[in-house]
């Protein structure tokens, strides 16, 4: 009778994470009597995966009925595979011994490789907003994939970016890997509606890459332009002055009117109009009673946008010489929330 051989016919097995791995093993003889054990790895540090004789192995099932006396198929299935299960598995025949069974013969081993999908890419931008013409950095991270080969691309509004650096960790062998990439993006005034996209392609995704996005609306600050104009006389002795605040983003904005350097009124932008490019316009106006003034008035529109230092625009209101009318120093009636009488 030929000496027992342990045959593991598969040199390698590739399994997707979450699926079941089948590790095949047969013996060529029933003799010598003794149990089969499965190990991951070799040497003293090997990990017991299944013992036919004793123990509880909830993830392992046998392919054949091992209680059958003539059974020589010792293949096993391991359920719910994760990247941590990767390694070389050995089917080892023991011969009966007293008090302990003795290792008799090992199969050649089967390398289990686990294909694991990358996690959804997470794109994050700078902590603080930046203004057009500035360069900002975006990072993209994805984890838990195997094998190591992976492709990452950056896009801005569908256009591929080239200024980025990518690292896959760890460099050596591992059960799973992570990718980290940093892209540099130059902001323009039109980027409120823009998107930055990180795209990850991996063998497990079957040609359908994963994408992570970041909206530049979270990153960009477009400072406003100001224009102060004097409107035609609305009524006798009254002048309407407007401050046009144009092309700003985000909406958070506070406007203060100053008369000859003194605060006249402060208001917060509320009813704004949105431009096609996503920026906002807003207008504030002031009704000035010129009859109350002997001298010229310097009106200043001061805007604080998104917590930044204030910008301002001034307008000199010319006051023509005229006799002071009786009672002109009494308060005139306010005619609107954006109106202001000057005495």
């Amino acid at each position: 009778e030929e000496e027992l051989q342990v045959i593991q016919p598969d040199k390698s097995v590739l399994v997707a994470a979450g699926e079941t791995a089948t590790l095949r093993c047969t013996a060529t003889s029933l003799i010598p009597v003794g149990p089969i054990q499965w190990f991951r790895g070799a040497g003293p540090g090997r990990e017991l995966i299944y013992n036919q004789k004793e123990g509880h192995f909830p993830r392992v099932t046998t392919v054949s009925d091992l209680t059958k006396r003539n059974n020589m198929d010792f293949s096993i299935r391991i359920g719910n595979i994760t990247p941590a299960d990767a390694g070389t598995y050995y089917c080892v025949k023991f011969r009966k011994g007293s008090p302990d069974d003795v290792e008799f013969k090992s199969g050649a081993g089967t390398e289990l490789s686990v294909r694991a999908k990358p996690s959804a890419p997470v794109v994050s931008g700078p902590a603080a907003r930046a203004t057009p013409q500035h360069t900002v950095s975006f990072t993209c991270e994805s984890h838990g994939f195997s094998p190591r080969d992976i492709t990452l691309k950056w896009f801005k509004n569908g256009n591929e970016l080239s200024d980025f650096q990518t690292n896959v960790d760890p460099v050596g062998e591992s059960v799973s890997y992570s990718i980290h990439s940093t892209a540099k993006v130059v902001l323009t005034r039109e980027d409120v509606h823009s998107q930055v996209i990180c795209e990850v392609a991996h063998v497990t995704l079957q040609g359908d890459p994963l994408r992570g996005t970041a909206n530049l609306s979270e990153t960009i600050r477009v400072p406003p332009t100001l224009e102060v104009t004097q409107q035609p006389v609305r009524a006798e002795n009254q002048v309407n002055v407007t401050c046009q605040v144009r092309k700003f983003y985000p909406q958070r904005l506070q406007l203060t009117w100053l008369e000859n350097g003194n605060v006249s009124r402060t208001e917060t932008a509320s009813t704004v109009t949105e431009n096609k490019d996503g920026t906002y316009n807003w207008m504030s106006w002031l009704l000035v009673n010129v009859s109350a003034h002997r001298d010229d008035v310097k009106l200043t529109c001061q805007v604080e946008h998104d917590g930044q230092p204030a910008v301002s625009k001034s307008h000199d209101l010319k006051v023509s010489a005229h006799p002071k009318e009786q009672g002109s120093n009494t308060a005139a009636e306010n005619t609107g929330s954006n109106e202001r009488n000057i005495y």
Epitope: L30, V33, P35, K53, D65, T67, K68, N70, K96
Partner: antibody
Framework: QVQLQQWGAGLLKPSETLSLTCAVY????????WNWIRQPPGKGLEWIGE???????NYNPSLKSRVIISVDTSKNQFSLKLSSVTAADTAVYYC??????????????????WGQGTTVTVSA | SYELTQSPSVSVSPGQTASITCSGD?????YAWWYQQKPGQSPVLVI????KRPSGIPERFSGSNSGNTATLTISGTQAMDEADYYC?????????FGGGTKLTVL
């Protein structure tokens, strides 16, 4: 501990079919092989065959063509049929259990509990 | 087919050690079982898996198995140990019994 009680016809004519039944009391029916063994008068033991709860059988090659062992899990019973009997089949027939609980593997379980035996005589 | 050979009889004085042997090709690579059968009774398992004793079997019964020979040893043999003893092993999912050994306690 499992207990076995066996019964069946004790006197047969040549060419008839021997039929014996063994009832199992106690133990988990699904963790045993169930055996039949016979012993001709004044001679040694001869293994006939075995069956487990799922109907998997092993037979002695010398008797295989004439033997059927079956199992009725609903009654916790197993049976032996031996066809075309001759005087050479005269023997005491025993049923026996082979437990294969945790820690077992093929060839690690033998016949640990035996029935009381049934004497079968084949005579014209 | 596989065969197990036992000497037909062994005699021993009370209190002495009786050794009953069973030989077969590379028997040590298989498990050996030993059964005791007294006249008119069913066999009783006394040793399983070479050297293990079922509960209820006295400690004087022991077993060993190596090479081509399995041995049942009864130390301090008593008159009640007089019986036929059968060894058994498995060959390709077939149970094989030895021819039996009659132990006589003188």
């Amino acid at each position: 501990q499992v207990q076995l009680q066996q019964w069946g016809a004790g006197l047969l004519k040549p060419s008839e079919t021997l039929s014996l039944t063994c009832a199992v009391y106690g133990g988990s029916f699904s963790t045993y092989y169930w055996n039949w063994i016979r012993q001709p008068p004044g001679k040694g033991l001869e293994w006939i065959g075995e069956i487990n709860h799922s109907g998997s059988t092993n037979y002695n090659p010398s008797l295989k063509s004439r033997v059927i062992i079956s199992v009725d899990t609903s009654k916790n019973q197993f049976s032996l049929k031996l066809s075309s009997v001759t005087a050479a089949d005269t023997a005491v027939y025993y049923c026996a259990s082979s437990h294969y609980g945790s820690g077992s593997f093929p060839d690690s379980y033998g016949m640990d509990v035996w029935g009381q035996g049934t004497t079968v005589t084949v005579s014209a | 087919s596989y065969e197990l050979t036992q000497s037909p009889s062994v005699s021993v004085s009370p209190g002495q050690t009786a050794s009953i042997t069973c030989s077969g090709d590379k028997l040590g690579d298989r498990y050996a079982w030993w059964y005791q059968q007294k006249p008119g009774q069913s066999p009783v398992l006394v040793i399983y898996q070479d050297d293990k004793r079922p509960s209820g079997i006295p400690e004087r019964f022991s077993g060993s198995n190596s090479g081509n020979t399995a041995t049942l040893t009864i130390s301090g043999t008593q008159a009640m140990d007089e019986a036929d003893y059968y060894c058994q092993a498995w060959d390709s999912s077939t149970a094989v019994f030895g021819g039996g050994t009659k132990l006589t306690v003188l």
